[in-house]
């Protein structure tokens, strides 16, 4: 169920001043699509780990990636899995824990001095081979902040949206990802009917801009529900 909530296995920080108890007592928290919420007052420990369903890496924590729990499993069933440590096997950067990236199928340290050259080489390799290293998924902040010293302009190669300049997002284009404009009001957007379905897109659209959501165009009457046009509309 979606109300599986994780907690770290140690309390590292005291409550802040005026703090309340864990779980925000007296305040019910609920979810919208793709949203995380606690089950009542209880938080599970990592030892009691219950995986969280996801559609992409960005929905998971920074120490997780989104994938099918079984090898060759149903692509429609994906959960947040713990990231892979150094020297473990990987297929893309997001599988490796922060401070590492995927090179030749192995998680290696993103050593600041050699990092940029190696990453560029990896990107080149991914175009020439089976696209297994960069398949259009995001990498963590620690990786992208070392990789990109300036924010990418439209068309620049990126790994995640924070690599792109304001007003752009990082979206799939063939088997890489590039910075594309965030959608404006009235522009056509993609509404995913099931989790994981956007893994099939090779030309991914950005999300709708702030204050907009992707909804069926009111005046767009078609026989098939699935073929209705979605556009970015004010909330």
């Amino acid at each position: 169920t979606l109300n599986s909530v994780l907690n770290s296995n140690a309390i590292k920080n005291l409550p802040p001043p005026l703090g309340g108890a864990a779980g925000h007592p007296g305040s019910a928290v609920s979810a919208a699509p793709g949203i995380l919420y606690p089950g009542g007052n209880k938080y599970q420990t990592i030892d009691n780990y219950q995986p969280y369903p996801c559609a992409e890496d960005e929905e998971c924590g920074t120490d997780e990636y989104c994938a099918s729990p079984t090898r060759g499993g149903d692509a429609g069933v994906q959960i947040c899995l713990a990231c892979r440590k150094r020297r473990k096997r990987c297929m893309r950067h997001a599988m490796c824990c922060p401070g590492n990236y995927c090179k030749n199928g192995i998680c290696v340290s993103s050593d600041q001095n050699h990092f940029r050259g190696e990453i560029e080489e990896t990107i080149t390799e991914s175009f020439g081979n089976d696209h297994s290293t960069l398949d259009g998924y995001s990498r963590r902040t620690t990786l992208s902040s070392k990789m990109y010293h300036t924010k990418g302009q439209e068309g620049s190669v990126c790994l995640r949206s924070s690599d792109c300049a304001s007003g752009l997002c990082c979206a799939r284009h063939f088997w890489s990802k590039i910075c594309k404009p965030v959608l404006k009001e009235g522009q056509v957007c993609t509404k995913h009917r099931r989790k994981g379905s956007h893994g099939l897109e090779i030309f991914q659209r950005c999300y709708c801009g702030e204050g907009l959501s992707c909804r069926i165009q009111k005046d767009h009457h078609q026989a098939s529900n699935s073929s209705r046009l979605h556009t970015c509309q004010r909330h």
Epitope: N13, I35, P38, E58, T62, C80, S162
Partner: nanobody, 125 residues
Framework: EVQLVESGGGLVQAGGSLRLSCTAS????????VGWFRQAPGKEREFVTG????????YYADSVKGRFTISRDNAKNTAHLQMNSLKREDTAVYYC??????????????????WGQGTQVTVSS
């Protein structure tokens, strides 16, 4: 270390709107969960809404669902809370907080490591 500063609070009539901003200094912001909490006079601080490191997940207290919207811009190290259809009971000091977003979950309040000083929101009838 992350420093958080809230802005945008003020006096507004019931039914009106306000947009709060939370500006962070420090690189850890873009890998942190951001939450908004509020504390009304004589009451405990309560969770209002939260957003994960990437903006792909958001969560809301039932009392604000459908009226409040949280968003973030990691490129600008900011988070926003758009508050519409404000009610008298929304009157409180609003705090922005952030903490490490290592796992897909709602972060319990004690794990928020960095807190702003708060901004007052007063809704009059």
């Amino acid at each position: 270390e992350v420093q958080l500063v809230e802005s945008g609070g003020g006096l507004v009539q019931a039914g009106g709107s306000l947009r709060l901003s939370c500006t962070a200094s420090g690189r850890a912001f873009s890998s942190s969960v951001v939450g908004w909490f509020r504390q009304a006079p004589g009451k405990e601080r309560e969770f209002v809404t939260g957003i994960n490191w990437s903006g792909a997940r958001t969560y809301y207290a039932d009392s604000v669902k459908g009226r409040f919207t949280i968003s973030r811009d990691n490129a600008k190290n900011t988070a926003h809370l758009q508050m519409n259809s404000l009610k008298r009971e929304d009157t409180a000091v609003y705090y922005c907080a952030s903490g490490r977003d290592r796992y897909a979950r709602v972060l319990p309040e004690y794990e928020y490591e960095w807190w702003g000083q708060g901004t007052q929101v007063t809704v009059s009838s």
